[in-house]
């Protein structure tokens, strides 16, 4: 039994659970997902039993080996996978555990503007970046671009303080997860602050 292997997949993609076995005489190999049997292989008779019909087209064993390839990944395929190799030559089965994380490809992040104040010619507000569908494990970075600056800010909330008369700035939110990255539409400080002067309430940008 080796250490737990962490695997990452993307929705619609495929992942292979690598299995290297030194066992000579294998009687059966059982793959399970969150304690539910997924596939049983009996090498002697060349039998592969896929427990659930819906997984039949998604399960494959590439190159004639016992490594499990799972295709057409869905979010709820995330979880713990476990393989047991059973053999009369072994006192107890050889096992390996895997943890699969399936992530969605990120759409464009949305930006909302918080309450705003315009005092002494300075426009002060927060921009908040988020994913519309609440995707998990998303890391947000803000890029602030302008003649006077090219800065990055980590986190979903960007505090803004911009003086009227300063050179315009552009703000872009970048969202990343382990399988994809995307960016928001650019937001111009001048437009943001003009709009806020008219409407003091929080709004979508």
């Amino acid at each position: 039994s080796g250490p737990v292997k962490e695997l990452v997949g993307s929705v619609g993609g495929a992942v292979t659970f690598p299995l290297k076995s030194k066992v000579k005489q294998v009687d059966s190999i059982v793959w399970t997902f969150n304690t539910t049997p997924l596939v049983t292989i009996q090498p002697e008779g060349g039998t592969i039993i896929v427990t659930q019909n819906r997984n039949r087209e998604r399960v494959d064993f590439p190159d004639g080996g016992y490594s499990l390839k799972l295709s057409k990944l869905k979010k709820n395929d995330s979880g713990i996978y476990y393989v047991g190799i059973y053999s009369s030559s072994l006192q107890q089965p050889s096992t390996q555990e895997y943890v699969l994380h399936v992530y969605e490809h990120l759409s464009k992040p949305k930006v909302t503007m918080g309450l705003q104040s315009n005092k002494n010619g300075t426009c002060v507000t927060n921009l908040t970046c988020c994913m519309e569908h609440g995707e998990e494990d998303v890391i947000y970075t803000w890029k602030a671009l302008g003649q006077a600056a090219n800065e990055s800010h980590n986190g979903s909330i960007l505090p803004i303080s911009w003086r009227w008369g300063e050179s315009d700035m552009t703000f872009i939110c970048v969202a990343r997860n382990p399988v994809s990255r995307n960016f928001s539409s650019p937001i111009l400080a001048r437009k943001l602050c003009e709009g806020a002067a008219d409407d003091p309430d929080s709004s979508m940008v």
């Epitope: 993609g13 992530y103 671009l145 990055s152 970048v174 990343r176 382990p178 399988v179 990255r181």
Partner: antibody
Framework: EVQLVESGGGLVQPGGSLRLSCAAS????????MSWVRQAPGKGLEWIGE???????INYAPSLKDKFIISRDNAKSLYLQMNSLRAEDTAVYYC????????????WGQGTLVTVSS | DIQMTQSPSSLSASVGDRVTITCKAS??????VAWYQQKPGKVPKLLIY???TRHTGVPDRFSGSGSGTDFTLTISSLQPEDVATYYC?????????FGQGTKVEIK
Amino acid sequence: EVQLVESGGGLVQPGGSLRLSCAASGFDFSRYWMSWVRQAPGKGLEWIGEINPDSSTINYAPSLKDKFIISRDNAKSLYLQMNSLRAEDTAVYYCARPDGNYWYFDVWGQGTLVTVSS
Amino acid sequence: DIQMTQSPSSLSASVGDRVTITCKASQDVGIAVAWYQQKPGKVPKLLIYWASTRHTGVPDRFSGSGSGTDFTLTISSLQPEDVATYYCQQYSSYPYTFGQGTKVEIK
């Protein structure tokens, strides 16, 4: 010093295959998306595709998807497997790293020339 | 795919001249545009990203502007070392695409 070094180019016959490698040094390769870009002699740049840090996502230019396979390992190498090569695949092949993991490339390898000819 | 059309395809100008290269996208790409310089026999070098932000170490005679579908790279005062081919790239959507290049020479 941040560096990318391609290898594996050379002369190959039409219909043949070739595997290019790109060795990275001077940065944490395991954190970066990586791309392949090619340039036919006297022509412009063409993006081939990219791979994310753990190889779970690979995006290709649709016109090249069926003949090229991008892969990587954690020993700081990026690969491009090229199959069914034709004369029009003759080009300098570059591996490129995006600046700060964004979408524009600040580090390029020196390129490796692939010539497809009988 | 988004097409990036550069013009002119080549130009010749005198040292000190202001040089302008344009890039037109076949659809809106916001400001997701980068510019590269490729000197003869060399590898491409990043000049500008997010349409107008200069990359570290790029001389301030290089500037970028534009949004949507129309983008411009300007060299305010052409220098002999600027002889190169310049490429625009869009990264708004897959596949990333480059312009066909603009070759800049000295008169």
